[in-house]
Interface confidence: low
């Protein structure tokens, strides 16, 4: 059994993740990760689902967050900025947009890097799954520590 | 004795830091921090060695981030983009990279100024040590709050 | 009685709110946030002042966050960068600056969008409060998610 | 303990193979640019090939179309198959990493300052 599992006791145990980005040959625009390189999956009360969610298993307050690096030219792009969303789908009920990020595209030739960080506390009901959705997946950089995702309890 | 010390128990304090950027006349990429300003160290559990790196003395999850505020000019600068990495030394292992940003250069003239977050939840272990490397480190701001670095033990 | 209370127990209480950004009419630098939407407000150790302002009741260390993304255009801006600062005032003190980010306008027309993420570990008297200043408020986005403030109890 | 391994040299004749592997311990070696360089006696070091830890790859001139690096993941592994090997290709050959090679990580480079960690090396000799 992982070792962070009973650091704070049965009735609380630590639960934390940090998942990795993956190039997806899929057109989705939600991003996909893995549990690769120096990932953090606490225990069994927060799993990465199909690769695209976080999925915890109790209800209480998470400090979630997502880092996205993408690369982009103004020219070679749509005009509207690029945007990365943190969602959240709970049991029951719709998605719902928890935070957004948008950086115009850059001028630079082929294209410009930017980085965009995400975060912030929200309530989770037990079966909630948060995942990174973003407008042109094709920009994302996938080099060693440059997208991540990730949450921690409270 | 610090007052965070003991707000958790002999057994599990809270262990944070959060030190403030300083100038260097060093020519090293690694970005020098000290404890000045409102900076937090919550106790002994986490010390700043050589103003360059976090250490820790207890295993376990931690929150680690950084900001860096900088100020660069696409035609003064090198093709290649700013980067700011947050890299893990542990004890008789390689240094790695844990989290990345990639900034392009500014257009602006002299140069235009861009910050850079970084955040996540990692292991480490006791003895290891987290430092902050920059591709280059005479474009970093370091006016009050600009640049900083810190974790928090979950 | 709020179900987050009683999480950690009597003696330590659960303490983080997250706000969401609200626009204003008024001329101030100061950014207005409101209880609305997928916030949190965990119980009353921390509240929402004025609209402007989160303010603690118990002492100790806070990990403190801002994210404003904004809209702007070189020509139409002044030459300064656009800058978010996360700033303390303590009872009877003067306020401080904890931290700042600092972007510079975008080329983009009629506005390039920028966000800007702010976080930190900080020790917060009873009766500390923390605010968010901008250059120019009228260039911040207020959609959904795009701008929000929070901190979380450690 | 971080150590690189090498193995596979010997002697071969002209227009042989031989498989060079590189061995990583004390580390996940999927995650680092990992570089083949070479060293002929009385000669400077030279990069030979490398590979990124996102699996792209680059060659010297000199044995474009002749050698092949890959990397096996599962075995902590990275292979140098060299091809119509040559006399002028007998040196001792060094795999060598650093935790920050590439661009994004999807390129490396074959020049010997890059890098920071070095095999003891295995030896190639190309003689009839």
């Known amino acids: 059994e992982n070792s962070f599992e009973m650091q704070k006791g049965d009735q609380n145990p630590q639960i934390a993740a940090h998942v990795i980005s993956e190039a997806s040959s899929k057109t989705t625009s939600v991003l996909q990760w893995a549990e690769k390189g120096y990932y953090t999956m606490s225990n069994n009360l927060v799993t990465l689902e199909n690769g695209k969610q976080l999925t915890v298993k109790r209800q209480g307050l998470y400090y979630i967050y997502a880092q996205v690096t993408f690369c982009s030219n103004r020219e070679a792009s749509s005009q509207a900025p690029f945007i990365a969303s943190l969602c959240l789908k709970s049991p029951g009920r719709f998605e719902r947009i928890l935070l957004r990020a948008a950086n115009t595209h850059s001028s630079a030739k082929p294209c410009g890097q930017q980085s965009i960080h995400l975060g912030g506390v929200f309530e989770l009901q037990p079966g909630a799954s948060v995942f990174v959705n973003v407008t042109d997946p094709s920009q994302v950089s996938h080099g060693t520590g440059f997208t991540s995702f990730g949450l921690l309890k409270l | 004795e610090n007052s965070f010390e003991m707000q958790k128990g002999d057994q599990n304090p809270q262990i944070a830091a959060h030190v403030i950027s300083e100038a260097s006349s060093k020519t090293t990429s690694v970005l020098q921090w000290a404890e000045k300003g409102y900076y937090t160290m919550s106790n002994n559990l986490v010390t700043l060695e050589n103003g360059k790196q976090l250490t820790v003395k207890r295993q376990g999850l931690y929150y680690i981030y950084a900001q860096v505020t900088f100020c660069s000019n696409r035609e003064a600068s090198s093709q290649a983009p700013f980067i700011a990495s947050l890299c893990l030394k542990s004890p008789g292992r390689f240094e790695r990279i844990l989290l990345r940003a990639a900034n392009t250069h500014s257009s602006a003239k002299p140069c235009g100024q861009q910050s850079i977050h970084l955040g996540g939840v990692f292991e480490l272990q006791p003895g290891a040590s987290v430092f902050v490397n920059v591709t280059d480190p005479s474009q970093v701001s370091h006016g009050t709050g600009f640049t900083s670095f810190g974790l928090l033990k979950l | 009685e709020n179900s987050f209370e009683m999480q950690k127990g009597d003696q330590n209480p659960q303490i983080a709110a997250h706000v969401i950004s609200e626009a204003s009419s008024k001329t101030t630098s100061v950014l207005q946030w409101a209880e609305k939407g997928y916030y949190t407000m965990s119980n009353n150790l921390v509240t929402l002042e004025n609209g402007k302002q989160l303010t603690v009741k118990r002492q100790g260390l806070y990990y403190i966050y801002a994210q404003v993304t904004f809209c702007s255009n070189r020509e139409a801006s002044s030459q300064a960068p656009f800058i978010a600062s996360l700033c303390l005032k303590s009872p009877g003190r003067f306020e401080r600056i904890l931290l700042r980010a600092a972007n510079t306008h975008s080329s983009a027309k009629p506005c390039g969008q920028q966000s800007i993420h702010l976080g930190g570990v900080f020790e917060l008297q009873p009766g500390a409060s923390v605010f968010v200043n901008v250059t120019d408020p009228s260039q911040v986005s207020h959609g959904t998610g795009f701008t929000s403030f929070g901190l979380l109890k450690l | 303990e971080v150590q690189l391994v090498e193995s596979g040299g010997g002697l071969v004749q002209p227009g042989g193979s031989l498989r060079l592997s590189c061995a990583a311990s004390?580390?996940?070696?999927?995650?680092?640019?990992i570089g083949w360089f070479r060293q002929a006696p009385g000669k400077e070091r030279e990069g030979v090939s490398c590979?990124?830890?996102?699996?792209?790859?680059s060659y010297t001139d000199s044995v474009k179309g002749r050698f092949t690096i890959s990397r096996d993941n599962a075995k902590n592994t990275v292979y140098l198959q060299m091809n119509s090997l040559k006399p002028e290709d007998t040196a001792v050959y060094y795999c060598?990493?650093?935790?920050?090679?590439?661009?994004?990580?999807?390129?490396?480079?074959?020049?010997?300052?890059?890098?920071?960690?070095w095999g003891q090396g295995t030896l190639v000799t190309v003689s009839s």
């Open positions: 004390g580390f996940t070696l999927e995650y680092y640019a």
């Open positions: 060598a990493t650093d935790p920050d090679r590439g661009f994004l990580g999807s390129s490396c480079d074959t020049q010997s300052h890059q890098y920071d960690f």
């Open positions: 590979i990124s830890s996102e699996g792209s790859t």
